[in-house]
Interface confidence: medium
Amino acid sequence: EELQVIQPDKSVLVAAGETATLRCTATSLIPVGPIQWFRGAGPGRELIYNQKEGHFPRVTTVSDLTKRNNMDFSIRIGNITPADAGTYYCVKFRKGSPDDVEFKSG
């Protein structure tokens, strides 16, 4: 069955200064490729976390994404402020050349 990206929480309420946990799981290991988290959708969406590369000091992963069989792509965002409000999407990419291709969004 084709991979699904599941974000089970419709909304997450967090007090200022606290940590937000954004849950995301994939239903399959195939296709191979990284997960990215974005705030918003469209060309102007904001990258929150990239499994493959980059430095995201406020973000930690809930599980160890380096493990081959991991399908939990949940993240924690620390020190939440009102400016962090918005809709967050967990997006699965398919490995491609030269660039990875967006495959499915939560």
């Epitope: 918003g40 959708a41 469209g42 060309p43 102007g44 969406r45 967006e102 495959f103 499915k104």
Partner: antibody, heavy 124, light 113 residues
Framework: QVQLVESGGGVVQPGRSLRLSCAAS????????MHWVRQAPGKGLEWVAV????????YYADSVKGRFTISRDNSKNTLYLQMNSLRAEDTAVYYC?????????????????WGKGTTVTVSS | DIVMTQSPDSLAVSLGERATINCKSS????????????LAWYQQKPGQPPKLLIY???TRESGVPDRFSGSGSGTDFTLTISSLQAEDVAVYYC?????????FGGGTKVEIK
């Protein structure tokens, strides 16, 4: 020729459900993202929802999130909008529209083909 | 959500004269990766669905007369009808597609003076 034809509109009571359909012809339906856009009587345009060409991604306006579901059947060249928990403010002409972005484009840049619309009236 | 503000609400122009419609977005719709503004213009005649005129702020859709032109970048955009024809009487909408939800301006009604 390229055509979109909506159906399924009508008069419905608040809290009830309705399913709109949009039949596509004249182009490769499975290669295009599709939208629903609505227009309340005498008002402007309001985007409702979009679905990717392959159904993989769906996005909704906040005003309908959790109540409306967009879906498609590429084998039938048909787009759907399941509308639940309808409210008076959902009263509008509902248009389906083709996304200019196809399977090869990440993001749309306009809606280039529109149906004539189907009217939904929510009233007790 | 990005708010799109159109001005004026309505416009009366003599046949053959220039009509100018403005659209301002509450944040930039310029995508730095491809240097394109994700802004479209539509024409809606009474009793008809909208018709795409312009995309990427200034690219004319196929089949649209060249009297229609779009300009601007970032947050400020303009639709110009260089020589108004009777068939141009309609409501014109701008729309941003940079951040979902794609949002429309309130519309500008163009009439013959």
């Amino acid at each position: 020729q390229v055509q979109l034809v909506e159906s399924g509109g009508g008069v419905v009571q608040p809290g009830r459900s309705l399913r709109l359909s949009c039949a596509a012809s004249g182009f490769t339906f499975s290669s295009y993202g599709m939208h629903w856009v609505r227009q309340a009587p005498g008002k402007g345009l309001e985007w409702v929802a979009v679905i990717w060409y392959d159904g993989s991604n769906k996005y909704y306006a906040d005003s309908v999130k959790g109540r409306f579901t967009i879906s498609r059947d590429n084998s039938k060249n048909t787009l759907y909008l399941q509308m639940n928990s309808l409210r008076a403010e959902d009263t509008a002409v509902y248009y389906c529209a083709r996304d200019t972005g196809s399977a090869t484009t990440m993001w749309l840049y306009g809606m280039d083909v529109w149906g004539k619309g189907t009217t939904v009236t929510v009233s007790s | 959500d990005i708010v799109m503000t159109q001005s004026p609400d309505s416009l009366a122009v003599s046949l053959g004269e220039r009509a100018t419609i403005n659209c301002k977005s509450s944040q930039s719709v310029l995508y730095s990766s491809n240097n394109k503004n994700y802004l479209a213009w539509y024409q809606q005649k009474p009793g008809q669905p909208p018709k795409l005129l312009i995309y990427w702020a200034s690219t004319r859709e196929s089949g649209v007369p060249d009297r229609f032109s779009g300009s601007g970048s970032g947050t400020d955009f303009t639709l110009t009808i260089s020589s108004l024809q009777a068939e141009d009487v309609a409501v014109y909408y701008c729309q941003q597609l940079y951040i979902y939800p794609p949002t429309f301006g309130g519309g500008t009604k163009v009439e013959i003076k």
